[in-house]
C-alpha cells in the first residue's frame, strides 16, 4: 500500500524532517508550507492551520521560497551613471549596471553599487588594456615609432606614418609630418586596434564614449585624494 500523503500542517516523524518547500515551525511544532517567490508569510501556521501567504507590496520582493514576515525591500533607484537592467518586481530586485564609458568600481551580488568613469589615456599614452564591466582602462606610454594624439579611453598607440621626406618627425603624442609626397603607414610591433570594451549585457552592445569633459576617474561617492594614474587625465 502506498504511504499516506501528509497535508500541511503535520507533525514530522520522530527524528524526521519536513519536505521540500516546507519548514518546521518551532512554536506550532509542525511542518508547514513555505511561501512562493513574490509572496511572504502573512500568518504563520498553527497546529491546525497552514501558513497564509500574501503578495509582496510595491517596491518589495521575494526571489526565493520563504517564511518571512515581510518581503525584502528593492534597492534604491539607479543613479545617473547607471542603467536599470532589471526592474523591481514582486519576484526580483532591481539591478543597476554601469552605462557605457563607465565600469563597476564596487560591485554587489547582482549589479553594481558604485560606477566610475573609465580612465582616459592622455596624448603620448595609449590603451594597454581596455576597460571591462568591472575593471578600468590601463594606459601605457607610446613606444618609439608610435603615437597617440587623443585623450581617449579606447585609442591605442598608432604607428607613425613613414615619409619619403620627413617635414616634422613624429613623437609619442604627434604623428610624423611628411612633405607633399605620399606617405606610407608602418606597422609597428603590437599596433593592433583595440575595440571599445563591450559589456556582457545585451543592453550595452552599442557603447558610446563618455563626455570628454569628465575627469579621468570620477567616483560618485567622495573618495580620498589620490594621484592620477600614469598616462591618465587628471586635474
Amino acid at each position: 500500500l502506498p504511504a499516506q500523503v501528509a497535508f500541511t500542517p503535520y507533525a514530522p516523524e520522530p527524528g524526521g524532517t519536513c519536505r521540500l518547500r516546507e519548514y518546521y515551525d518551532q512554536t506550532a511544532q509542525m511542518c508547514c508550507s513555505k511561501c512562493p517567490p513574490g509572496q511572504h508569510a502573512k500568518v504563520f501556521c498553527t497546529k491546525t492551520s497552514d501558513t497564509v501567504c500574501d503578495s509582496c507590496e510595491d517596491s518589495t520582493y521575494t526571489q526565493l521560497w520563504n517564511w518571512v514576515p515581510e518581503c525584502l525591500s528593492c534597492g534604491s533607484r539607479c543613479s545617473s551613471d547607471q542603467v536599470e537592467t532589471q526592474a523591481c518586481t514582486r519576484e526580483q530586485n532591481r539591478i543597476c549596471t554601469c552605462r557605457p564609458g563607465w565600469y563597476c568600481a564596487l560591485s554587489k551580488q547582482e549589479g553594481c553599487r558604485l560606477c566610475a568613469q573609465l580612465r582616459k589615456c592622455r596624448p603620448g599614452f595609449g590603451v594597454a588594456r581596455p576597460g571591462t564591466e568591472t575593471s578600468d582602462v590601463v594606459c601605457k606610454p607610446c613606444a618609439p615609432g608610435t603615437f597617440s594624439n587623443t585623450t581617449s579611453s579606447t585609442d591605442i598607440c598608432r604607428p607613425h606614418q613613414i615619409c619619403h621626406v620627413v617635414a616634422i618627425p613624429g613623437n609619442a603624442s604627434m604623428d610624423a609630418v611628411c612633405t607633399s609626397t605620399s606617405p606610407t603607414r608602418s606597422m609597428a610591433p603590437g599596433a593592433v586596434h583595440l575595440p571599445q570594451p563591450v559589456s556582457t549585457r545585451s543592453q550595452h552592445t552599442q557603447p558610446t564614449p563618455a563626455p570628454s569633459t569628465a575627469p579621468g576617474t570620477s567616483f560618485l561617492l567622495p573618495v580620498g585624494p589620490s594621484p592620477p594614474a600614469e598616462g591618465s587625465t587628471g586635474d
Epitope: 514530522p12 520522530p14 527524528g15 524526521g16 524532517t17 519536513c18 519548514y23 518546521y24 518551532q26 512554536t27 513555505k34 508569510a41 521575494t62 526571489q63 526565493l64 521560497w65 520563504n66 517564511w67 518571512v68 514576515p69 515581510e70 525584502l72 525591500s73 530586485n93 551580488q109 547582482e110
Partner: antibody, heavy 128, light 112 residues
Framework: QSLEESGGDLVQPGASLTLTCTAS?????????MCWVRQAPGKGLELIAC?????????WYGSWAKGRFTISKSTNLNTVTLQMTSLTAADTATYFC????????????????????WGPGTLVTVSS | DIVMTQTPASVEAAVGGTVTIKCQAS???????LSWYQQKPGQRPKLLIY???TLASGVPSRFKGSGSGTEFTLTISDLECADAATYYC?????????????FGGGTEVVVK
Amino acid sequence: QSLEESGGDLVQPGASLTLTCTASGFSVNVNSYMCWVRQAPGKGLELIACIDTGSGGSTWYGSWAKGRFTISKSTNLNTVTLQMTSLTAADTATYFCARARNTYGYGDYVYGGAFDPWGPGTLVTVSS
Amino acid sequence: DIVMTQTPASVEAAVGGTVTIKCQASQSISSTYLSWYQQKPGQRPKLLIYQASTLASGVPSRFKGSGSGTEFTLTISDLECADAATYYCQGGYFSDNGCYNAFGGGTEVVVK
C-alpha cells in the same frame, strides 16, 4: 527543556578546542535552530554561529568568526558542537549555547530570533 | 552586516521609577526580528521580549517593547531592585546573499 555546555578549559594561544552543547527535554535533531554566543569578561554578547539542525542543515557565522569556528551537530548524541582553532587571548570568554524559539527563512538562509532556552555557559581561557 | 547600537550604555534610576533603553539598527528591520534579553552578573541571559513587543512567558507587564524600522525601545516601569541587570537587544534581516544577526552592546540598569 534545557541546554548545558561543556569543554571549556584553559588553553595556550594557538591551540584548538571543541565545545559541546547537550540538549535535554527536546531533540536537537528535529528541526531546531541552535546557536553559540560568547561573552568576554565584562563585555557584551557576541553571536558566533548557528545551525539549522533540520533537513536544511544550513549554518550561519558572524563575519568575524568565519574560518576559525565550525558549528556542527551530532545526530546520535543530541548535541551541537563548536570547534575553535588558532585561539588567542581575545577568545577568552564564557561560551553559551542557545536555541531559537522562532525561525524565519528565505531560501536556504534561516534567521533565529528570540533565544530561549540558554545554557549556563562554559568558560574558555586562552593564556600562556 | 548589521550593527545594533544601544543607548545609553548605563542608566541609574530609583525604585518605582521608569527606565527607557533605545536600540538602533544600522538598517531597517522587521519588528519580527527584534528581541530583548536581561542578564544579571554571573548568570545566563534571559529572554524578555520577542517580535519587538511580545512578552516572553513569566515576564511582568512592567516591561514593554515598542518600535519599528530602525528605532526600538525597551521601557521598564515601576522599577524594582530585581530589575538591576544588563539589557541587550538582538536584531537582524535577510538579503539575497544571506542573513544578518547581531546583539546590541548592552545597557546596564542600576537601581538606587
